[in-house]
Amino acid sequence: FKNDATEILYSHVVKPVPAHPSSNSTLNQARNGGRHFSSTGLDRNSRVQVGCRELRSTKYISDGQCTSISPLKELVCAGECLPLPVLPNWIGGGYGTKYWSRRSSQEWRCVNDKTRTQRIQLQCQDGSTRTYKITVVTACKCKRYTRQHNESSHNFESVSPAKPAQHHRERKRASKSSKHSLS
């Protein structure tokens, strides 16, 4: 089975994936993300996403010798975006142009909006089963950042996915660093 897969979505409304709770210890996990998109203008060819760029992540979760029975699905909120109030002015200037001229002091980024606690089962090599709670992202939102924000709060870095089984080939991806916790 695959270690992870990502489907890029550009929807504004996302139904929660059937998944769900909170915890204490760290869970080794695969995490998918997106490239950091930047743009210098508000033209039709801009690579800044309208609304939020949502990645549908599918991954297996591993805890030592135990691996999730099924892959877990969740959203990864990544990249730059435009808030919905700006969208009507996307073409033809107006407020959108004024907003964009201030980009040096503020930017909009796609961040986690809604999360859900999810119980999952892990199958262990010794035949036993474990259960944990993790937190999964179910919706993204466009949030404004200014120079006052710590740059590291929305930087991207390279993260290695978890290897749920020995035969899984490790693949590096640029992603937001984030860890699920167990309880």
Epitope: P16, P18, I69, R119, I120, Q121, T131, K133
Partner: antibody, heavy 123, light 107 residues
Framework: EVQLQQSGPELVKPGASVKISCKTS????????MSWVKQSPEKSLEWIGE????????TYNQKFKAKATLTVDKSSSTAYMQLKSLTSEDSAVYYC????????????????WGQGTSVTVSS | DIQMTQTTSSLSASLGDRVTISCRAS??????LSWYQQKPDGTVKLLIY???RLHSGVPSRFSGSGSGTDYSLTISNLEQEDIATYFC?????????FGGGTKLEIK
């Protein structure tokens, strides 16, 4: 076959404590959260809390946080609930109920229930 | 906490009838809605999870539907063994909460 066998009825005095057991069989005990539910005529069904048999960590309904303590004994695949400082309002039937999983994912339903333990608080 | 309301506390129906029991949540519960059957002897069984998915071993005459805040359980061809009290339960947000129950009786 999955089975949750609860301990017998209890008649206790006000102010006392009681410990109810739920012995499980037919499945991997550590692979499923265990919930406890109270049923009284006045309040229908109320979720008390849940415990993760893997870690022993528990989550409580705020209403029962000072009343109930959930524990497990992995060696005997048994879950326990202790109720303290009992009053007449604690007189009810208490159920243990296993978290349901479908292909390893929970949909927050309880798929198997014990037969219930009646607790009567009376002087 | 999310309030779950079953407006009909009891209803009478004839064998063979199609019966629908409704349940309303005080806020959107994203389909995390389960239905349970409690027999007169106190035995509780899960019927439906995640709004419409049938738990293993449950007869196909039971079905569930709904979305947002409004959900329902339907028994398509009422049988004697279906005489029980039915509870809905939301699992979208902790604490889990239950409806007050609907007692089903034979007319």
């Amino acid at each position: 076959e999955v089975q949750l066998q609860q301990s017998g009825p209890e008649l206790v005095k006000p102010g006392a404590s009681v410990k109810i057991s739920c012995k499980t069989s037919g499945y991997s005990f550590t692979g499923y959260y265990m919930s406890w539910v109270k049923q009284s005529p006045e309040k229908s069904l109320e979720w008390i809390g849940e415990i993760n048999p893997t870690t022993g960590g528990s989550t409580y309904n705020q209403k029962f946080k000072a009343k109930a303590t959930l524990t497990v004994d992995k060696s005997s695949s048994t879950a326990y609930m202790q109720l303290k400082s009992l009053t007449s309002e604690d007189s009810a039937v208490y159920y243990c109920a296993r978290e349901g999983y479908y292909s390893g994912i929970s949909y927050d339903a309880m798929d198997y229930w014990g037969q219930g333990t009646s607790v009567t608080v009376s002087s | 906490d999310i309030q779950m309301t079953q407006t009909t506390s009891s209803l009478s129906a004839s064998l063979g009838d199609r019966v629908t029991i409704s349940c309303r949540a005080s806020q959107d519960i994203s389909n995390y809605l389960s239905w349970y059957q409690q027999k007169p002897d106190g035995t509780v069984k899960l019927l439906i999870y995640y709004t419409s998915r049938l738990h293993s071993g449950v007869p196909s005459r039971f079905s569930g539907s709904g979305s947002g805040t409004d959900y329902s359980l339907t028994i398509s061809n009422l049988e004697q063994e279906d005489i029980a009290t039915y509870f809905c339960q939301q699992g979208n947000t902790l604490p889990r909460t239950f409806g007050g129950g609907t007692k089903l009786e034979i007319k």
